[in-house]
């Protein structure tokens, strides 16, 4: 798998928050590629040396996933081809808070963007009529 080293693609993330004990979404989009097999998604977390998640050649590749994320991550595989690299994080923990990097490689080049993910016990505000 080769990429033309210095070409960059646009990657966009959105800061978000996750409710402890529930599932959360870390949003990331990128310039789509024609072939799914040419797309690599790598999610990284600041201070964590293993990968949060990796998706390549149309499927998850979790051999280098860090233990703290084992069994808790997934991408929306059917939406990767249209440029959606968002990560689903199951059973959000307090320690999941921090800075994440969404790193994308395609046949057009590579790109990345960071996002801040907050965690806590959030509740929907009650509206009294």
């Amino acid at each position: 798998f080769g990429i033309s080293g210095r070409h960059s693609i646009t990657v966009t993330t959105v800061a978000s928050a996750g409710n402890i004990g529930e599932d959360g979404i870390l949003s990331c989009t990128f310039e789509p590629d024609i072939k799914l097999s040419d797309i690599v998604i790598q999610w990284l977390k600041e201070g964590v040396l293993g990968l949060v998640h990796e998706f390549k050649e149309g499927k998850d590749e979790l051999s280098e996933q860090d233990e703290m994320f084992r069994g808790r991550t997934a991408v929306f595989a059917d939406q990767v081809i249209v440029g959606n690299a968002s990560l689903r994080l199951k059973n959000v923990q307090l320690t999941d808070a921090g800075t994440y990097k969404c790193y994308i490689i395609t046949s057009k080049g590579k790109g990345n963007a960071n996002l801040e993910y907050k965690t806590g016990a959030f509740s929907m505000p009650e509206v009294n009529v």
Epitope: V40, L44, K45, G47, V48, G50, M68, T95
Partner: antibody, heavy 121, light 107 residues
Framework: EVQLLESGGGLVQPGGSLRLSCAAS????????MHWVRQAPGKGLEWVSA????????YYADSVKGRFTISRDISKNTLYLQMNSLRAEDTAVYYC??????????????WGQGTTVTVSS | DIQMTQSPSSLSASVGDRVTITCRAS??????LAWYQQKPGKAPKLLIY???NLPTGVPSRFSGSGSGTDFTLTISSLQPEDFATYYC?????????FGGGTKVEIK
Amino acid sequence: EVQLLESGGGLVQPGGSLRLSCAASGFTFNTHAMHWVRQAPGKGLEWVSAISGSGGSTYYADSVKGRFTISRDISKNTLYLQMNSLRAEDTAVYYCARLLGRFGEYGMDVWGQGTTVTVSS
Amino acid sequence: DIQMTQSPSSLSASVGDRVTITCRASQNIYTWLAWYQQKPGKAPKLLIYDATNLPTGVPSRFSGSGSGTDFTLTISSLQPEDFATYYCQQSYSTRWTFGGGTKVEIK
């Protein structure tokens, strides 16, 4: 000035123990992952162990797993390598090194001067 | 573990020569590759990170290229202070591994 200074090396008998220290200065210690790398006499570089910035995750080469323990004391800005059950093949210069980048994907940009460990009877 | 194979293991060159060292990974490591220079009795020095990027203070005669499994370190015009041993290192896996080294000697 960003600096790493190792200490604790010396001559030890096979089966013995040593604790190496690496004092860090000039940077925010707890935001960087740290490594220990060794170099046997006349040989190449061999990665030994790593620890995340928080100290929550540790990693070891198969050759030292179960014998060596990496740790860090953020209040003292110091990295440690506890070496037990030492063998002749652990004889080397041991370097501590700082990992460049916030996400662990880059190289080791700051190195100490090294401390020599000799395991011999 | 990911194996890193460097070639050649040693080479002789003259000041002003263009020198190329190659590093091959046993599996795809994308651009998670660094190059180091080490002189006798000294600690290694980072030359290149992320396969192509030079840290501040590294002379521009050093350059890195490649992605996937094949990588190259090039010294465009060898200087007297460049005679040393060079190592590649991958950080894709959390079992970090170095290449065996390439010793650059004076012809």
